[in-house]
Interface confidence: low
C-alpha cells in the first residue's frame, strides 16, 4: 500500500491496533522490513507499507483526520471529499474525521444528502455499521451532538464555533463519498439546530446534546421539523431529567408557523403538543445550575408524523357539565406489540394537547378530537358514582343507569361504563330493575348480546361478584344489601345499534339482611340457568342469597341442580338451602355440607330458593348451578 498526503492538506492518517481480538497470531505493519503496530502519516508524507498477515482488518483500524481552519483564512465550503480516496486505503475499518474550527460568529451547516440520518441512543448500533458521530464546541469544551445512522430524517445540522464530524465505515463497506457538504451560515446564537425532514408518515427519535449525560448548562438547542402540510405531527417525551436550577427555568419552546401564540412554552413534565400541521420548531432551553448539586438536564423524545384521519378534523363535544362524580377515560385497548412502525393513536383535548390516553371529568364541557389511523385501537371507560348519604332523602328515589348519548356518539368504542352505587350502611339497600328482563351468563347458556351488566360488591373488603347479566332472560330484578358496582361492558361494535336495549333503574329501598335477592319470572318453553354469586371462587363465608321464582297458574316449574353434592366443607357453622313454597309456606331444608342435593323437583306455585353459606375450609367452596323450566300443567292440582 502507498499513502501520499499532499502538503498543506492538513490530513493525518493513523493506522493502529483496533479492539484486541483473541487471534493467536499477531499482525504487524511492515515498513522497510520493520514491524510496527502503529503508523502515523502526516501532510506532505508518502509511505509505502504492507501487513504481515492475510486479514489485517481483524487487527487494525485506520483514522483519517482532516483539520479545517476557518479562523485564519477562507473556509473550503461545499461537498466534502473522502481524502485520500477509499480505493487507495487498505481495507480496514475506517474513520474519517473532519475537525472544523471557526469563529463564534460563524455558523456552520452540515448538509446530508439522501439517505438522511437517524439518531441512535447509547448502546444502539447501525445495521450497516456506518455511523456518523457529530460534536460541537463551546469554548474549549467538546459537546456531543449525537451519533447517527443512515435512513432517517435528519437533513441538516447547524452549529457555530466549530464542528467535528466522524464518519465510521466498516472495512467491507463500498462507500466512497462522504455524503455531506459544509456551508457557512450566519451565527445561529445557540448550540445547534437539527433539521428533520419527513416526506410521509414516520417517526424520529432525537436526543439532547451529550445524551445520556447532561445537556450543557444554560444552552439552547433547536430542532426544526419539515412536515408536509397534509400530515400531522405529535411530540412525546420518552425520557427526561431536570437539573437543579439556580436561575431561569428549564423548558421546551415550540414555534409553529402561523400560530398566534408563538412561542408556546412547556415544562418538560407537561403533556407535549400533538396534531400539529406542517412545519414546526422545538427548542430545549437549559438553566443556570446549582454549583453544589447541578443534576443533569437530558431529553429523549419522539416525533410521530402521520395522516390526519377523517376524525382528526372533527371536534366532538362531550358535555359533562350536568354530570356529577363522573370520569371518562379514552385509552388504548391492550394489544400485542408489533415490531413494525405503527402510527400513533392519540386523543386530543382542544385539538392541541394530544396523548395516548385522556381522562375527562364531570362539571365541564370538553372538546376533543382524534389523531389516529384506526379508532378501533382506542376504547372508552367511564365511571360514575351515585351515592346516598341521607337515608331519609334517598329512600324510594330512583336513578336511570343509562349511557349518556354524548358518549354514544363518540367514534370510539365504549368498553366499560361503571356505576358505583353507594348507600348508608345498615340503613338502605338497592334494587336494580332492567328495562328488559336479564339472563345470567353461564357456561351452559352464555350471553351472546353486544353488552352485559357485571354486578359486584363495591365494599372494599368484600370479594363478591353477583354475575354477568344480559338482556333477554327471566331475571326481573336484583336486590342487593349494600354498595355495589354495576358495569355495562360492551363486547361488539354493534352495541351502538343495540344501545336502546340498555336501561337499568336503581332504587334505594329499605335495608334487608340478605346479600342478594333475584326475582325470576321464567318464560314458558325456555330453560332458565341460575348460579350462585362468585362462581369459580365460591360464595363468600356466611353469605346468604335468595331467588324468588314465579310460577304462572297454568304452569309447573321443574327445579334441577347440576351436581349431586355441593362440595362445600365447613370449617365453622352450617351451609344450608331452603326451598319454600310461597303459597303454603311449606319448606324443605337441605344441609349443603352433608346432604346430597335434591333430585329435580316440580313446583306448581311460586317458590323461594335460599342458599346460606358457612365458613368453608379453603379450596372447598360453595358453587351451585341450577335451572328452572316451565311446562304447562296437564292436571289442575289447585
Amino acid at each position: 500500500f502507498e499513502i501520499a498526503l499532499p502538503r498543506e492538506s492538513n490530513i493525518t492518517v493513523l493506522i493502529k491496533l483496533g479492539t484486541p481480538t483473541l487471534l493467536a497470531k499477531p499482525c504487524y505493519i511492515v515498513i522497510s522490513k520493520r514491524h510496527i503496530t502503529m503508523l502515523s502519516i502526516k501532510s506532505g508524507e508518502r509511505i509505502v507499507f504492507t501487513f504481515s498477515c492475510q486479514s489485517p482488518e481483524n487487527h487494525f483500524v485506520i483514522e483519517i483526520q482532516k483539520n479545517i481552519d476557518c479562523m485564519s483564512g477562507p473556509c473550503p465550503f461545499g461537498e466534502v471529499q473522502l481524502q485520500p480516496s477509499t480505493s487507495l486505503l487498505p481495507t480496514l475499518n475506517r474513520t474519517f474525521i473532519w475537525d472544523v474550527k471557526a469563529h463564534k460568529s460563524i455558523g456552520l451547516e452540515l448538509q446530508f444528502s439522501i439517505p438522511r440520518l437517524r439518531q441512535i441512543g447509547p448502546g444502539e448500533s447501525c445495521p450497516d455499521g456506518v455511523t456518523h458521530s457529530i460534536s460541537g464546541r463551546i469554548d474549549a469544551t467538546v459537546v456531543r451532538i449525537g451519533t447517527f445512522c443512515s435512513n432517517g430524517t435528519v437533513s441538516r445540522i447547524k452549529m457555530q464555533e466549530g464542528v467535528k464530524m466522524a464518519l465510521h465505515l466498516p472495512w467491507f463497506h463500498p462507500r466512497n463519498v462522504s455524503g455531506f457538504s459544509i456551508a457557512n451560515r450566519s451565527s445561529i446564537k445557540r448550540l445547534c439546530i437539527i433539521e428533520s425532514v419527513f416526506e410521509g408518515e414516520g417517526s424520529a427519535t432525537l436526543m439532547s446534546a451529550n445524551y445520556p449525560e447532561g445537556f450543557p448548562e444554560d444552552e439552547l438547542m433547536t430542532w426544526q421539523f419539515v412536515v408536509p402540510a397534509h400530515l400531522r405531527a405529535s411530540v412525546s417525551f420518552l425520557n427526561f431529567n431536570l437539573s437543579n436550577c439556580e436561575r431561569k427555568e428549564e423548558r421546551v419552546e415550540y414555534y409553529i408557523p402561523g400560530s398566534t401564540t408563538n412561542p408556546e412554552v412547556f415544562k418538560l413534565e407537561d403533556k407535549q403538543p400533538g396534531n400539529m400541521a406542517g412545519n414546526f420548531n422545538l427548542s430545549l432551553q437549559g438553566c443556570d445550575q446549582d454549583a453544589q448539586s447541578p443534576g443533569i438536564l437530558r431529553l429523549q423524545f419522539q416525533v410521530l408524523v402521520q395522516h390526519p384521519q377523517n376524525e382528526s378534523n372533527k371536534i366532538y363535544v362531550v358535555d359533562l357539565s350536568n354530570e356529577r362524580a363522573m370520569s371518562l377515560t379514552i385509552e388504548p385497548r391492550p394489544v400485542k406489540q408489533s415490531r413494525k412502525f405503527v402510527p400513533g393513536c392519540f386523543v386530543c383535548l382542544e385539538s392541541r394537547t394530544c396523548s395516548s390516553n385522556l381522562t375527562l371529568t364531570s362539571g365541564s364541557k370538553h372538546k376533543i378530537s382524534f389523531l389516529c389511523d384506526d379508532l378501533t385501537r382506542l376504547w372508552m371507560n367511564v365511571e360514575k358514582t351515585i351515592s346516598c348519604t341521607d337515608h331519609r332523602y334517598c329512600q324510594r328515589k330512583s336513578y336511570s343507569l343509562q349511557v349518556p348519548s354524548d358518549i354514544l356518539h363518540l367514534p370510539v368504542e365504549l368498553h366499560d361504563f361503571s356505576w358505583k352505587l353507594l348507600v348508608p350502611k345498615d340503613r338502605l339497600s338497592l334494587v336494580l330493575v332492567p328495562a328488559q328482563k336479564l339472563q345470567q351468563h353461564t357456561h351452559e347458556k352464555p350471553c351472546n348480546t353486544s353488552f352485559s351488566y357485571l354486578v359486584a360488591s363495591a365494599i372494599p373488603s368484600q370479594d363478591l361478584y353477583f354475575g354477568s347479566f344480559c338482556p333477554g332472560g327471566s331475571i326481573k330484578q336484583i336486590q342487593v344489601k349494600q354498595n355495589i358496582s354495576v358495569t355495562l361492558r360492551t363486547f361488539a361494535p354493534s352495541f351502538q345499534q343495540e344501545a336502546s336495549r340498555q336501561g337499568l333503574t336503581v332504587s334505594f329501598i329499605p335495608y334487608f339482611k340478605e346479600e342478594g335477592v333475584f326475582t325470576v319470572t321464567p318464560d314458558t318453553k325456555s330453560k332458565v340457568y341460575l348460579r350462585t354469586p362468585n362462581w369459580d371462587r365460591g360464595l363468600p363465608s356466611l353469605t346468604s342469597v335468595s331467588w324468588n321464582i314465579s310460577v304462572p297458574r297454568d304452569q309447573v316449574a321443574c327445579l334441577t341442580f347440576f351436581k349431586e353434592r355441593s362440595g362445600v366443607v365447613c370449617q365453622t357453622g352450617r351451609a344450608f338451602m331452603i326451598i319454600q313454597e310461597q303459597r303454603t309456606r311449606a319448606e324443605e331444608i337441605f344441609s349443603l355440607d352433608e346432604d346430597v342435593l335434591p333430585k329435580p323437583s316440580f313446583h306448581h306455585h311460586s317458590f323461594w330458593v335460599n342458599i346460606s353459606n358457612c365458613s368453608p375450609t379453603s379450596g372447598k367452596q360453595l358453587d351451585l348451578l341450577f335451572s328452572v323450566t316451565l311446562t304447562p300443567r296437564t292436571v289442575d292440582l289447585t
Epitope: I114, S155, G258
Partner: antibody
Framework: EVQLKESGGGLVKPGGSLKLSCTAS????????MSWVRQTPEKRLEWVAT????????YYSDSVKGRFTISRDTGKNNLYLQMSSLSSDDTALYYC?????????????WGQGTTVTVSS | DIVMTQAAFSNPVTLGTSASISCRST???????????LYWFLQKPGQSPQLLIY???NLASGVPDRFSSSGSGTDFTLRISRVEAEDVGVYYC?????????FGGGTKLEIK
C-alpha cells in the same frame, strides 16, 4: 437540465392493463417526490398518484385506488404507473411531474405526456 | 374533496396591458402553519403544463416577475402585469393542502 419522458401509452380494451414509465434525468431522482397527473380529452387536469421523495410513501386519488400502483426504480431513474381494470374514464394524456417537498413546490417539471386510450 | 372553480375564459386583453385570472376553492387553503397551498400552472398550446406560482405567492424558478398572485384563503387572483404573446394558454389553479390534490377547470387567456 431536468428532463422527464413518459412512455408505455397506447390503446387498450376495457378491463385491460398497461404499465407507464417515466425516465428522469438532470436531477437527483431519489430526493424528489414524483406524481402522475392526467389530462382528460376535455382538457381537465386530474391528479392520479404521488410517490414521496426519499421515503417512498404512496398516495392515490379515490378513482384509481386499488387499480393503479405507482413505483420507482432509483437505479434506472424510472417512475412507473401500473394500471389495471381500465375503463373509458381512464382515457387521458398521462404526465409525470416532480415535486420538491423541502421547498414546497409541486409540479415543478412535467414530461411531454403519453396517451392512454381505453376503448373496445 | 376540495373543489377548485375557474371561469373558462378571461376577458380579452391587449398585449402590454395587465390581466387577471381568478380561482375559488370550496375550503380555505390557508393552513395553520401560515402557508396557503395554492398553485398556478400555465399550459401553452401543444405543451405540457408548467409551474408559475407555488404556495400562493412564490414565483417558480425561471418565471418572469410579470406574474404575481394574491388572495385570501378561498379566493385567489393571478396577475400578469404586461401581457406578452407568449403568455397565451390555459391557466390552471390547484391545491395540495389535502388529498386528493385537485385542479381548477382552467381559464383560457384571450388576446384582443
Amino acid at each position: 437540465e431536468v428532463q422527464l419522458k413518459e412512455s408505455g401509452g397506447g390503446l387498450v380494451k376495457p378491463g385491460g392493463s398497461l404499465k407507464l414509465s417515466c425516465t428522469a434525468s438532470g436531477f437527483t431522482f431519489s430526493v424528489y417526490g414524483m406524481s402522475w397527473v392526467r389530462q382528460t380529452p376535455e382538457k381537465r387536469l386530474e391528479w392520479v398518484a404521488t410517490l414521496s421523495g426519499g421515503s417512498n410513501y404512496t398516495y392515490y386519488s379515490d378513482s384509481v385506488k386499488g387499480r393503479f400502483t405507482i413505483s420507482r426504480d432509483t437505479g434506472k431513474n424510472n417512475l412507473y404507473l401500473q394500471m389495471s381494470s381500465l375503463s373509458s374514464d381512464d382515457t387521458a394524456l398521462y404526465y409525470c411531474a416532480t415535486e420538491d417537498g423541502l421547498i414546497g413546490t409541486w409540479g415543478d417539471y412535467w414530461g411531454q405526456g403519453t396517451t392512454v386510450t381505453v376503448s373496445s | 374533496d376540495i373543489v377548485m372553480t375557474q371561469a373558462a375564459f378571461s376577458n380579452p386583453v391587449t398585449l402590454g396591458t395587465s390581466a387577471s385570472i381568478s380561482c375559488r376553492s370550496t375550503k380555505s387553503l390557508l393552513h395553520s402553519n401560515g402557508i396557503t397551498y395554492l398553485y398556478w400552472f400555465l399550459q401553452k398550446p401543444g405543451q405540457s403544463p408548467q409551474l408559475l406560482i407555488y404556495q400562493m405567492s412564490n414565483l417558480a424558478s425561471g418565471v418572469p416577475d410579470r406574474f404575481s398572485s394574491s388572495g385570501s384563503g378561498t379566493d385567489f387572483t393571478l396577475r400578469i402585469s404586461r401581457v406578452e404573446a407568449e403568455d397565451v394558454g390555459v391557466y390552471y389553479c390547484a391545491q395540495n393542502l389535502e388529498l386528493p390534490f385537485t385542479f381548477g377547470g382552467g381559464t383560457k387567456l384571450e388576446i384582443k
